[in-house]
């Protein structure tokens, strides 16, 4: 048994890390696999992940951590059964993926303007709480070349758009995703999308 | 919920040994390593040890010589002994939870309260 | 082993008053660390720990804060329960305790 491609793990920097990798052939990973890790300092427990397989010879495992911080350094030990196939390390702080936003809501209630808001996906005591922007990406449901990305740089998760600015009469489509800055981290996965009705229409001097 | 319950003698004469044995509920010992704690008024709290859910140990270099931290998982018990006891290991010794990957307490026992005295 | 230095030794206050309580470490020990909260005759109870992270089912009137050498724990409007003994506990290699502060009614 064999490793193809190693081990590499990305952290939502709050309790969950994952690790992905791909075995030289097919692999029940969660039968034949087992990945260790440990935090480097004295009187830490080791724990224990069983891999799911994730295509045929590709497994992955999503490590449980408390709140992470910028030091915490981690061992991994990939083993099959009495075998040590592979042995690495994983700095959560430097390799972080944020958790995608949540409730992305659309409020059309003043006439005018969209509104979208959206959750921060952490709490405020999470180090990554106040460093997040975000990425709204709106698209026309019908003419996917109709699509536009919002950066949102400061802190508030809401965008508000000129109704104007989306054709009348059509179904458009959000979702919005989340990088921190200062941790130098990739995106997020997107947030569920979510649909409504631009019903606004130009007032009757400007038509 | 998450119990820890303590049992073990309250008086011990100099030179003799300490056994506590630690009872726990609501979560397996196979999932949680077991720590064990001391508080006394003149030296406040002490770490002493630790048996991990895979059943290593790791021990306060000051205490190593003289204990030793067992358990038996099905019997959701601990086991605490510590030798050659004198006036200065009188304290309330404690046996508490591992949180999660930190070597914090989540859940503490009601500590067994040790005098040395011959 | 690293040594935690905590003040003041006691302290008197009223309830709805603000406290701080300082934890120094005689070395870096980065963000680990935990504040515990002891009332006379129980055992201590996890208030906070990776320095600032609250434990579950503590009130947010308490907040940890600091890295470093230098911590400190926060308990804003204080209430009636939360008078007694507060220990911080660092988790670098050996893990050990500050020798505590008393928080008494005023």
């Known amino acids: 048994m064999k490793v193809l491609q190693e081990p590499t793990c990305v952290s939502d920097y709050m309790s969950i890390s994952t690790c992905e990798w791909k075995m030289g052939g097919p692999t029940n990973c969660s039968a034949e696999l087992r990945l260790l890790y440990q935090l480097v300092f004295q009187s830490s427990e080791t724990h224990t992940c069983v891999p799911e397989n994730n295509g045929g010879v590709g497994c992955v495992c999503h490590l449980l951590m408390d709140d992470v911080v910028s030091m915490d350094n981690y061992t991994l030990d990939l083993w099959a059964g009495q075998q040590l196939l592979w042995k690495g390390s994983f700095k959560p702080s430097e390799h972080v993926k944020p958790r995608a936003p949540g409730n992305l809501t659309v409020h059309t209630n003043v006439s005018d303007t969209v509104l979208l808001t959206w959750s921060n996906p952490y709490p405020p005591d999470n180090y990554l709480y106040n460093d997040l922007t975000y990425a709204v990406n709106i698209w026309n449901e019908n003419d996917l070349a109709d699509s536009r990305i919002h950066n949102v740089t400061y802190l508030k998760p809401t965008l508000r758009i000129p109704a104007s600015t989306l054709k009348s009469g059509i179904s458009y489509r959000a979702r919005v995703r989340a990088w921190a800055q200062h941790y130098n981290t990739t995106w997020s996965e997107w947030s569920p999308s979510t649909k409504w009705y631009n019903s606004y229409r130009e007032p009757f001097e400007q038509r | 919920q998450v119990q820890l319950k303590q049992s073990g003698p309250g008086l011990v004469q100099p030179s003799q040994s300490l056994s506590v044995t630690c009872t726990v509920s609501g979560f397996s010992l196979t999932n949680y390593g077991v720590h064990w704690v001391r508080q006394s008024p003149g030296k406040g709290l002490e770490w002493l040890g630790v048996?991990?859910?895979?059943?290593?140990?790791d021990y306060n270099a000051a205490f190593k010589s003289r204990l030793s931290i067992s358990k038996d998982n099905s019997k959701s018990q601990v086991f605490f002994k510590m030798n050659s006891l004198q006036a200065d290991d009188t304290a309330i010794y404690y046996c508490?939870?591992?949180?999660?990957?930190?070597?914090?307490?989540?859940?503490w026992g009601q500590g067994t309260t040790l005098t040395v005295s011959s | 082993d690293i040594q935690m230095t905590q003040s003041p030794a006691s302290l008197s206050a009223s309830v709805g008053e603000t406290v701080t309580i300082t934890c120094r470490a005689s070395?870096?020990?980065?963000?680990?660390l935990a504040w515990y909260q002891q009332k006379q005759g129980k055992s201590p109870q996890l208030l906070v720990y990776n320095a600032k992270t609250l434990a579950e089912g503590v009130p947010s009137r308490f907040s940890g804060s600091g890295s470093g050498t230098q911590f400190s724990l926060k308990i804003n409007s204080l209430q009636p329960e939360d008078f007694g003994s507060y220990y911080c506990q660092h988790y670098v290699s050996p893990l050990t305790f500050g020798a505590g502060t008393k928080l008494e009614v005023k």
């Open positions: 508490a939870r591992n949180k999660g990957t930190r070597p914090v307490f989540d859940y």
């Open positions: 070395e870096n020990i980065y963000s680990y």
């Open positions: 048996i991990w859910s895979g059943g290593s140990t």
